[in-house]
């Protein structure tokens, strides 16, 4: 008796998170004897879609001519061989940019920072929103969720940074959403660039720091350190 | 119990367009794909499309890709086919059909099927 | 596209009878063949799906067998009320396809 058939890889180009109104196409990869692939979305009922595969059979293409809310969410993938069904896919949350406005970035107290003071980025909404994300331009990841306590709804959210080192240096971004779904994101604020001056310490952080330097530190959440946010909202590392 | 319900007759013009209804009731109507399947007097089978009433997906047959679109209306669980610039080759009998979505992607439920007539 | 043969278009049989109708794929479907039943008045159900599963409702008296690409349904004791055109069908790619039908007679 064979084991279970591999799960296939689902990705999505240009990538997972993607502006209101732009393409984007999902892919799924089994192996040469898949039959049909299924795509699943999380809460929906039927399968979402199945597609026959593209030669060589490999995988298949789903396709999303156009971005709107209904397609943000958490897909899995399937694919169906002579023997039978796939495992599923690892999940793919597909995200959509600009279901709100865009937030306000800045610096406290100001974007020059010398290496080893403090720096708090501050991203701001014009309306109550009760979770927020900080980005930093070529990162991985998402380098921080803040998200309010009980649902209460906040117009700031702060990310201190201490003692910031040449690591914190770079371009940031943030946006805002509400818990209902955070799939749904605002269009993003304006860039923010922090400038990291001097060498108060070594800029190489330290292993304690989180920061593996094998990966190179924009493959890492980046770990700030300082109190939570006095704000009502609570830090989830990502 | 699960039922599809599908006008009788529609009698249509040549190079006009007729839009087939599907009733569907007795289940959850955005859980399962509905197909679409044609059939002309004395002759087989043949599908036209399938669509999944919860996010309007659609997979058509190459050959009326550019004859039938199919859509939903969720808040009256009805399917819709619309065919355009009929000719004598669109009178048929046109049934939609639920699909079972299991092994053998069968279709395990019918209509009683609209009988299209293309006469001026 | 698969394409479903039926090589029989039409088929006479005394009630009582066993009868077998036959369907062939142009490829391996791997079991995704299905068995509809449609009467002189136009109403179509489903028999068996995944080559031998009987859908609910249907008579014992249906069964399906087969595998790769040649499939057969057998009613193991024919009645009245089996009169009809049989079709099979192939879910294993799309587009979907049917075979031609069976037309089922009483001699």
């Known amino acids: 008796q064979a084991g279970p058939l591999p799960k296939p890889t689902l990705w999505a180009e240009p990538g997972s998170v993607i502006s209101w109104g732009n393409s984007v196409t999902i892919w799924c990869q089994g192996t040469l004897e898949a039959r049909e692939y299924r795509l699943d979305k999380e809460e929906s009922p039927a399968p979402w879609d199945r597609q026959n595969p593209l030669e060589p059979k490999n995988k298949a293409r789903f396709s999303i001519p156009s971005m709107t809310e209904d397609y943000a969410g958490r897909y899995r993938c399937y694919y169906r061989s002579p023997v039978g069904w796939s495992q599923p896919s690892d999940p793919l949350e597909l995200v959509m940019t600009g279901a709100y406005s865009k937030p306000t970035l800045s610096a406290l107290p100001s974007p020059l920072v010398t290496s080893g003071k403090s720096v708090t980025l501050l991203c701001q909404s014009r309306s109550p929103m009760d979770t927020f994300l900080l980005i930093k331009e070529r990162a991985a990841h998402p380098l921080l969720h803040l998200r309010s306590e009980h649902g209460a709804q906040q117009h700031q959210a702060e990310f201190p940074m201490s003692p910031v080192t040449s690591v914190h240096g770079g371009t940031y971004r943030c946006f805002s959403s509400h818990g209902f779904s955070h799939y749904l994101l605002s269009h993003p604020s304006d860039p923010l660039e922090l400038i990291v001056s001097g060498s108060l310490e070594d800029p190489r952080p330290s292993p304690t720091r989180s920061v593996s330097t094998a990966a190179g530190p924009e493959d890492q959440p980046l770990m700030p350190t300082g109190s939570v946010p006095h704000s009502g909202l609570r830090r989830h590392w990502e | 119990q699960v039922q599809l319900q599908q006008p009788g007759a529609e009698l249509v013009k040549p190079g006009a367009s007729v839009k087939l209804s599907c009733k569907a009731s007795g289940y959850t109507f955005t859980s399962y794909w509905m197909h679409w399947v044609k059939q002309r007097p004395g002759q087989g089978l043949e599908w036209i499309g399938e669509i999944n009433p919860s996010n309007g997906r659609t997979n058509y047959n190459e050959k009326f890709k550019s004859k039938a679109t199919l859509t939903v209306d969720k808040s009256s669980s009805t399917a819709y086919m619309q065919l355009n610039s009929l000719t004598s080759e669109d009178s048929a009998v046109y049934y939609c059909a639920r699909d079972r979505y299991d092994e053998g992607n069968a279709m395990d439920y019918w209509g009683q099927g609209t009988s299209v007539t293309v006469s001026s | 596209d698969i394409v479903m043969t039926q090589t029989t278009s039409s088929l006479s049989a005394s009630l009582g009878d066993r009868v077998t109708i036959s369907c062939r794929a142009s490829?391996?479907?791997?079991?995704?063949l299905n068995w509809y039943q449609q009467k002189p008045d136009g109403t179509v159900k489903l028999l068996i799906y995944?080559?031998?599963r009987l859908h609910s409702g249907v008579p014992s008296r249906f069964s399906g067998s087969g595998s790769g690409t040649d499939y057969s349904l057998t009613i193991s004791n024919l009645e009245q009320e089996d009169i009809a055109t049989y079709f099979c069908q192939q879910g294993d790619t799309l587009p979907r396809t049917f075979g031609g039908g069976t037309k089922l007679e009483i001699k």
């Open positions: 995944y080559t031998s």
């Open positions: 490829q391996d479907i791997t079991n995704y």
